[in-house]
Interface confidence: low
């Protein structure tokens, strides 16, 4: 049915001609994401008609129809003026039950309603800066915690649980006082953690799930962003000891996920987003991925258990086949190994015998080839000066921040992007701080030594000399054609 | 029957691997000396990488030394201001309040008369009242239509710090200033076993003997480029723009004879500078024939593959190319705060409407 | 840019089958999630079926579940949807689309496509 008939039964305000247009519109557009410019106005109009009867009260018998039909226009870039109201995105959030002003209400909300009622403030949300600012104003974030906090003693359904995370995401990612709000006054991470917590269905001690299933990952997923939303710029700050348990008890869970897969082609999503978290973790909690007790089939090395550390170099291997996206799918998982390296000599060990083990093949330039390392050493000279200096950084740290050793693994050249940023270049300290860290040279490596160019990082014959046969005067003319190109070049 | 070796055949052998050891540790000594060249054009972040060593290799400098810095920071400050005023009158621009003028006057006085490494008061009310001029901001806009030195703000902004009677300057503002340099400044280094000879070429022409020396056996070259020079406008003097200025003298140690085996790391240098002006001025400025979008990435990419692609011998030859900003020397607790915006935008971006 | 040039469109009696290509050009095609999509002249369009980057993982419409099938040949920078059982309501013009975005959230919910070819008509004729 066409927007403008559906304007013309509103107009005329018969209750079953209403009902059976907006059922057909809603029937037609279900999936329509995408408008024609023809009827922009005849939309509009529907959209005026539908938010003025919201404003007074939609009849409890056809809320739904009615909140489909706001949901399939609230799409429609050109109608947002019209819901994006301080009225309309109270009714909204009446209907949503999370409206601050209103008691609760006394009989359970019909969910049907709650949940098409939180669908369309997810669109507005979305993409309205005016209703952004007004659901901040509306202080909409406040009943949304409280529900998320009841999920544990009441059950609601998974899509109002997921539809009430995905706007607390929306309204943390584009509002950063609602972050604010979140993170401080309302407890949000304690909140969030208890959440994540109870939609894994685990507690800490246990062994992880094997495989999520795809309604826990979506919602787990959910959780995870808004506590990245609310860490990222709250917990570079020192944390006293009651927040720091309380983080490393988020960092148990999150080692879970990392350990976890999800249903579905899911996993690998499920754990970006836990790696995006972890890398907002205080570094003092970051020791919790190798608390891990050791245990039947774990992974380990120097007493401590791996697997997590494990897990999370497979997801580096994983991200660096992709050559979109690069920053934010290498950059967080490289920052997180890098701090537990530099913090935990197990693990620094055991990532340096995975990605820098004793050099053998010295014939072959350190950035070719299908290798972690080759692929990382090829990222110390990518475009992103970010993904450039994270890789560079691991790296370095592996070598136990020894300049020497950096460029023995990656070459002079490819190492001169860091050691320029770090103020390197001539060697800094001696060596790293990490004096008993010993470094194994294979037979193989002593044997090429003498011939391998520092600068290129491989084997190299001595190549003739170009100015060979020429006499000094010779050799004067052609020193002096490039000094004059130099004169030139710094004047 | 077993092969057993008397006791004199056995020292023997000892002998002879202690020969050859001794012989492989000559070579090893020779081969791992590492011979470096140093260049780039005045304005390219080429000291930067010198002063920087200078920073951290040898504990940074000491007070005295940077109290010594504190006659070239006032000179470049001065410059830089008297720069921006000189360049209003070629660029038709009015002072904000025409109350600067006097203030424009008096600065040439008082610049004239200041004694070397000291900044009087007056003359620091002069320059701050001038900076804060909208006229002279407008300018100061469009240095890339003039010579101003790329510090320029830093020091203006600092004025305050910087005019204090008890003032010394700090390891950045080091970083930050400008002297011309000249001649070859050599600089050794030692990474454990590797030995370092690095020389700073800078325009002078000294005994050629000692330029010969300099050029013969070069492991690599490290060519500094100023990515934000794409933009400036030709001095009357000059026949082309910086930055073909520099692909042609790439091109030329590139492909020269004397360098046919030797690396090349190319600094493409103040990527920050460049990122903020790619949004305003666009890169056909400088290659009229660029087709791609003034994004950071796409326009960084073209000017690499610009100078890589002047490299004559690619199978045999390698260009190690780095994006820096010179004059960050913050040794960064590393977290990805870079990334973290990103994040939170590809997280919006993949939510999808209902 | 991704350019997409659609193929194999035609007439059909119901029942039979038609396999429509679609192949990219400029950028390489395989870091894209790729889809189908039909519009019936006057309507809005239509989601068919999307595959994701390495086509480990494709979605469908209900309409069109168990008749067609989405797959792509990265090698070869195609995609392709195999219809078969075709009934005269799948008469439309068929567009091949690409998208960056992830291909969950096209299970999701409805993303708009960034890329989309100019279109191949499919008439099937009871």
């Known amino acids: 049915m066409e927007p403008r008939a559906v304007a013309d039964a509103l107009e005329t305000g018969e209750e079953d001609a209403v009902t059976e247009a907006l059922r057909s519109f809603n029937r037609e557009h279900s999936q329509s994401f995408t408008f024609d410019d023809a009827q922009q106005e005849d939309r509009k109009r529907l959209a005026k008609l539908l938010v003025s009867v919201l404003e007074q009260g939609l009849s409890p018998k056809h809320r739904v129809t009615w909140l489909q039909t706001i949901r399939i226009l609230s799409r429609d870039r050109s109608c947002l003026d019209s819901f994006a109201s301080r009225q309309s995105l109270h009714a909204l959030a009446c209907y949503a039950d999370i409206a601050i002003s209103e008691e609760p209400i006394p009989q359970p909300p019909d969910m049907d309603v709650l949940l098409e009622s939180l669908k369309c403030l997810c669109n507005l949300v979305l993409s309205s800066p005016t209703a952004q600012m007004l659901a901040a104003e509306a202080r909409l974030v406040v009943r949304l915690a409280e529900r998320v906090g009841l999920y544990r003693k009441r059950s609601y359904p998974h899509e109002v649980q997921f539809f009430d995370l995905r706007l607390l995401f929306l309204l943390t990612a584009l509002r950063t006082d609602v972050r604010q709000q979140l993170f401080q006054e309302l407890h949000g991470v304690r909140l969030l953690t208890d959440a994540l917590e109870l939609t894994l269905g685990v507690a800490p001690k246990e062994n992880p799930l094997v495989i999520l299933p795809a309604q826990e990952t979506e919602r787990a997923m959910e959780i995870l962003k808004v506590l990245f939303n609310i860490t990222y710029d709250s917990v570079k700050r020192e944390v006293d000891e009651e927040d720091a348990a309380l983080y490393r008890y988020l960092g148990t869970l999150l080692r879970h996920c990392v350990m976890a897969d999800a249903a579905g082609d899911r996993t690998e999503e499920f754990h970006g987003h836990t790696v995006n978290l972890l890398g907002n973790l205080p570094l003092k909690c970051l020791d919790v991925l190798l608390a891990l007790e050791l245990h039947e089939g774990s992974l380990e090395f120097m007493g401590v258990n791996m697997d997590v550390i494990n897990a999370l170099l497979a997801f580096l291997e994983k991200r660096l086949h992709q050559t979109h996206r690069l920053k934010e799918c290498v950059a967080p998982v490289l920052s997180v190994l890098t701090e537990c390296a530099r913090m935990h000599r197990p693990a620094r060990k055991f990532l340096k015998a995975q990605v820098l083990p004793p050099l053998r093949d010295v014939r072959t330039r350190p950035e070719v080839g299908d290798l972690l390392r080759n692929k990382l050493v090829r990222l110390m000279t990518h475009l992103d000066t970010d993904v450039k200096r994270v890789a560079a950084e691991f790296l370095f740290v592996l070598c136990s921040e020894s300049v020497p050793r950096f460029i023995k693994y990656t070459g002079y050249g490819n190492a001169a992007g860091l050691l320029a940023a770090r103020g390197l270049m001539a060697g800094g300290r001696p060596e790293g701080q990490y004096s008993e860290d010993e470094d194994t040279d294979t037979e193989e490596y002593r044997e090429a030594k003498a011939s391998i160019n520092p600068v290129t990082g491989r084997v190299e014959e001595k190549p003739p000399n170009p100015m060979e046969g020429m006499t000094e005067e010779q050799k004067e003319h052609e020193a002096m054609k490039l000094v004059n190109m130099f004169d030139k070049l710094s004047r | 029957m077993g092969c057993t070796l008397s006791a004199e055949d056995k020292a023997a052998v000892e002998r002879s691997k202690m020969i050859d050891r001794n012989l492989r540790e000559d070579g090893e000594k020779a081969a791992r000396e590492v011979k470096l060249l140093l260049l780039g054009a005045g304005e390219s972040g080429k000291s930067t990488i010198v002063k920087q060593m200078k920073i951290i290799h040898e504990a940074g400098y000491s007070e005295e030394e940077c109290k010594q810095y504190k006659a070239v920071v006032y000179s470049n400050t001065i410059q830089s201001i008297i720069a921006i005023i000189r360049a209003m009158g070629r660029l038709k621009i009015d002072f904000g309040d025409a109350a600067r003028a006097d203030d424009a006057r008096q600065l040439f006085v008082l610049a004239g008369a200041a004694e070397e490494g000291f900044m009087t008061a007056e003359l620091a009310g002069v320059i701050k009242r001038l900076w804060k001029d909208s006229g002279v901001q407008a300018c100061f806009n469009r240095s890339r239509e003039y010579q101003l030195n790329d510090s320029a703000a830093y020091y203006l902004n600092d004025l305050d710090r910087i005019a204090q009677p008890n003032y010394i300057p700090t390891q950045q503002d080091v970083l930050r200033t400008r002297v011309k340099t000249t001649g070859i400044v050599e600089t050794h280094f030692t990474f454990k076993d590797l030995h370092f000879k690095m020389f700073d070429v800078g325009g002078q022409r000294s005994e050629r003997k000692k330029w010969i020396h300099c050029f013969e056996g070069v492991t690599a070259i490290i060519f500094c480029v100023a990515l934000s020079d794409y933009d400036l406008v030709l001095a009357e003097d000059e026949e082309m723009n910086r930055m073909h200025e520099s692909m042609k003298l790439f091109d030329s140690i590139c492909n020269n004879k004397w360098f046919t085996d030797t690396s090349i790391i190319l600094f493409l240098n103040k990527k920050d500078l460049f990122e903020e002006k790619i949004k305003k001025s666009p890169l056909t400025i400088c290659y009229p024939e660029y087709a791609g979008s003034n994004t950071y990435e796409e326009a960084a990419a073209y000017i690499q593959c610009q100078f890589e692609d002047l490299n004559k011998r690619k199978d045999t030859k390698e260009i190690y190319t780095h994006f820096t900003c010179a004059t960050d020397t913050k040794n960064v607790q590393f977290v990805f705060d870079a990334v973290t915006d990103v994040i939170i935008k590809n997280n919006l971006k993949d939510c999808g409407l209902f | 840019q991704v350019q997409l040039v659609e193929s194999g469109g035609g007439l059909v009696q119901a029942g039979g089958s038609l396999r429509l290509s679609c192949e990219a050009s400029g950028r390489t095609s395989s870091s894209y999630v790729m889809g189908w999509f039909r519009r019936v002249s006057g309507k809005e369009r239509e989601f068919v079926a999307a595959?994701?980057?390495?086509?480990?993982?494709?979605y469908y419409a209900d309409s069109v579940k168990g008749r067609f099938t989405i797959s792509r040949d990265n090698s070869k920078n195609t995609v392709y949807v195999q219809m078969n059982g075709l009934k005269p309501e799948d008469t439309a013009v068929y567009y091949c689309?690409?998208?960056?975005?992830?291909?969950?959230?096209?299970?999701?919910?409805?993303?708009?496509?960034?890329?989309w070819g100019q279109g191949t008509q499919v008439t099937v004729s009871s």
């Open positions: 595959i994701n980057p390495t086509g480990s993982s494709t």
């Open positions: 689309a690409a998208t960056r975005r992830d291909f969950y959230i096209i299970r999701n919910s409805r993303p708009q496509f960034d890329y």
